[in-house]
Interface confidence: low
């Protein structure tokens, strides 16, 4: 490590004094210090002498001696004060530039260490510092504003109390630059635009950044538009706004519009599409099948997508029958807007009752006219079964009626013993009726079918069962012949209430 003579950390001299600073090292040595006049440098191998015959306040500062060849990079320093009664400050720089949240050193060096007790930092014209300006002072280095903020970009003066009066340094301009996180933030409004030919339209492209140095432009189908720019400073951000006003749109105005902003960090862009149409339009669609089948007691949501311009002037859900004149409750109808020109309308039908099967129509109106979209809702029912004993053309016949939706299939079973339901072990015979006679089949109603089983002789210790099933469920009816006549009953479990 080099050694400095005189071997003191600080040296205090008067203006005009002769000062000699000698540095000795193992190899060649170099001096580094504040730029100031009147110094003479003399080097002799491993020593270097810095001297002046006329010290001034401008020589105040820290002088460091280094040994370039030293692998450890050791150095020695001495601080020189040239205490000039008229010049308490030696300002090394009149402009300091830092980024936000960095420490800003204002390099006003005190020329007399005795003055340290009376120093202060002020803004020019005697204005106090900003509230919560956190700073410290070092007589060797000056004032440090810790974690400087953009708003602290001001002109400062260092003040020292000399003989009862304040003596100011020349001013130091602090420039605190915003740390620019990236390209400017962008908004392009609206995100989508539709207009009828001849109408007015407005497209607004705006960009904002913490720093004022950025550019923004609006382009139409890759052509840059010449639009006056409005500038503003709001919420600690600079804003630049481009507003395109079109009094009467035509087809050539349609197309892609891009808002582009750039700064030193890069470029951002966002786009929207402008559609010009000849006349108003209203389109209804659904992602659902318009023919719906739901099991009775379950719920269903009917959804309609609407694309329209201009906006809707009216809309409603209507029940078209056939069962009753009830109308959907408004509270079950819900509307959501996907964007300006697309909407979704939902009709919620919870716990569907038999009387709610039928046609539901969504109607909407705008200046383009009325449009409607109709759903057909059929309810599914598990089969209901009944069996009677009768004579047809003189033959004893079991007649099974089954109603449900979809159309039920019918199976007859004959089993031993008297039972409410034949199980596999008891079954004597099984007949499938692939083509039962359809008695009724109206839209939105249950389908009723009839199956006949001709029985020459009823076996009294046996049970005849008619079973019907469809995709929803199954139903059955057991017929038990008894000596006094025939006895029929459904299984105990079969009590259907929708």
């Amino acid at each position: 490590i080099p050694v400095i003579e005189p071997s003191v950390p600080e040296l205090v001299v008067k203006p005009g004094a002769t000062v000699t600073l000698r540095c000795v090292g193992n190899g060649s040595v170099e001096w580094d210090g504040p730029p100031s006049p009147h110094w003479t440098l003399y080097s002799d191998g491993s020593s270097s002498i810095l001297s002046t015959n006329n010290a001034t306040f401008q020589n105040t500062g820290t002088y460091r001696c280094t040994e370039p060849g030293d692998p450890l990079g050791g150095s020695a320093a001495i601080h020189l004060y040239v205490k000039d009664p008229a010049r308490p400050w030696n300002v090394l720089a009149q402009e300091v530039v830092v980024f936000e949240d960095q420490d800003a050193l204002l390099p006003c060096l005190l020329t007399d260490p005795v003055l340290e007790a009376g120093v202060s930092l002020v803004r020019v014209r005697g204005r106090p510092l900003m509230r919560h300006t956190n700073y410290s002072f070092s007589p060797w280095h000056g004032f440090t504003i810790h974690r400087a903020k953009f708003i602290q970009s001001q002109d400062y003066q260092c003040s020292a109390l000399m003989g009862g009066r304040k003596v100011m340094s020349i001013s130091i301009r602090l420039k605190v630059q915003k740390v620019i996180p990236g390209p400017p933030a962008l908004t392009l409004v609206p995100a989508e635009l539709v207009r009828i030919r001849g109408e007015a339209a407005q497209i607004v492209c705006s960009a904002s950044s913490v720093d004022v140095n950025f550019d923004v432009f609006l382009q139409h189908n890759n052509t840059k538009l010449a639009i006056p720019q409005q500038s503003d400073f709001h919420n600690n951000r600079y804003q630049k706004v481009l507003t395109l006003n079109l009094d009467q749109v035509d087809f050539q105005h349609a197309g892609n519009y891009s808002c582009v902003a750039s700064n030193v960090q890069g470029k951002h862009s966002t786009s929207m599409f402008f559609r010009v149409v000849e006349s108003a339009y209203l389109n209804l669609s659904s992602e659902q099948n318009l023919i719906q089948e739901v099991t009775v007691g379950e719920g269903l949501n009917l959804k309609v997508m609407v694309e329209a311009y201009p906006g809707l002037q009216g809309f409603n859900w209507t029940y078209l029958g056939p069962f009753s004149d009830h109308q959907p409750e408004p509270k079950l109808a819900n509307a959501t807007t996907k964007d300006t020109y697309r909407h979704t309308f939902t009709l919620s039908l919870p716990r569907l009752k038999p009387s709610e099967a039928g046609r539901y129509s969504f109607l909407a109106r705008n200046p383009g006219g009325w449009r409607a979209l109709t759903f057909e809702l059929t309810l599914r029912y598990p089969p209901e079964v009944s069996v009677i004993w009768t004579f047809i053309n003189g033959s004893g016949t079991l007649l099974c009626a089954a109603s449900g939706y979809p159309q039920p299939n019918v199976t007859w079973l004959q089993c031993s013993g008297h039972t409410d339901r034949c199980d596999e072990a008891q079954v004597l015979q099984v007949w499938d009726d692939p083509y039962p006679e359809v008695l009724s089949q109206e839209p939105f109603h249950k389908v009723t079918v009839q199956s006949l089983l001709t029985v020459e002789t009823l076996e009294h210790n046996q049970t005849y069962e008619c079973r019907a099933h469809n995709s929803v469920g199954s139903g059955s009816w057991a017929f038990i012949p008894i000596s006094a006549g025939a006895h029929t009953h459904p299984p105990d479990e079969f009590l259907f209430t929708p």
Partner: antibody
Framework: QVQLQESGPGLVKPSETLSLTCTVS??????????WSWIRQPPGKGLEWIGY???????NYNPSLKSRVTISVDTSKNQFSLKLSSVTAADTAVYYC?????????????WGQGTLVTVSS | DIQMTQSPSSLSASVGDRVTITCQAS??????LNWYQQKPGKAPKLLIY???NLETGVPSRFSGSGSGTDFTFIISSLQPEDIATYYC?????????FGGGTKVESK
Amino acid sequence: QVQLQESGPGLVKPSETLSLTCTVSGGSVSSGGYYWSWIRQPPGKGLEWIGYIYYSGSTNYNPSLKSRVTISVDTSKNQFSLKLSSVTAADTAVYYCAAGIAATGTLFDCWGQGTLVTVSS
Amino acid sequence: DIQMTQSPSSLSASVGDRVTITCQASQDISNYLNWYQQKPGKAPKLLIYDASNLETGVPSRFSGSGSGTDFTFIISSLQPEDIATYYCQQFDNLPPTFGGGTKVESK
């Protein structure tokens, strides 16, 4: 945080000098980084800054009162004082002393409770 | 000197009301503006510093905004203890000057 307490005569005759003292506790008038201010408020009116003394001893006064005002510090008693000469009835007011942390610039972070001074013969 | 014009000079409001006070500086003062609350017989108390920053311990129903020459002070939901006179004060240039005050009374 420092506490401040004003003291001085509540009645001063016209053309005389109004003298008030502010005693500081919980801090030192000579410690770095404080502005010690005086503010006044005429009855039913707004607030008017009179001036401050910096911890280093430098002062700054309201130009409208500068010719009549002196603010000084007595470090041995941990006090600072206000002298307002040639008073008139217009100087009747509640006088507040206040402390401001130099780094904040507000000048008035902490206030005394105020003392009413009436100028009357 | 920088003149600070405060309005209104007084207002009546009910508990729960939103109260807005404005302060206008005669020249640009950046955001070197404070707001104080003063209750009868008491010294002013600092509520907002640097135009929009809430002093420690002050309820969040108080807020401030603005920059340059136009500033706003808001009490979002007036409480009985907020009945007082409110002052704005600039510290951009010496001498520091105060607005004329706004007396907030109970309706």
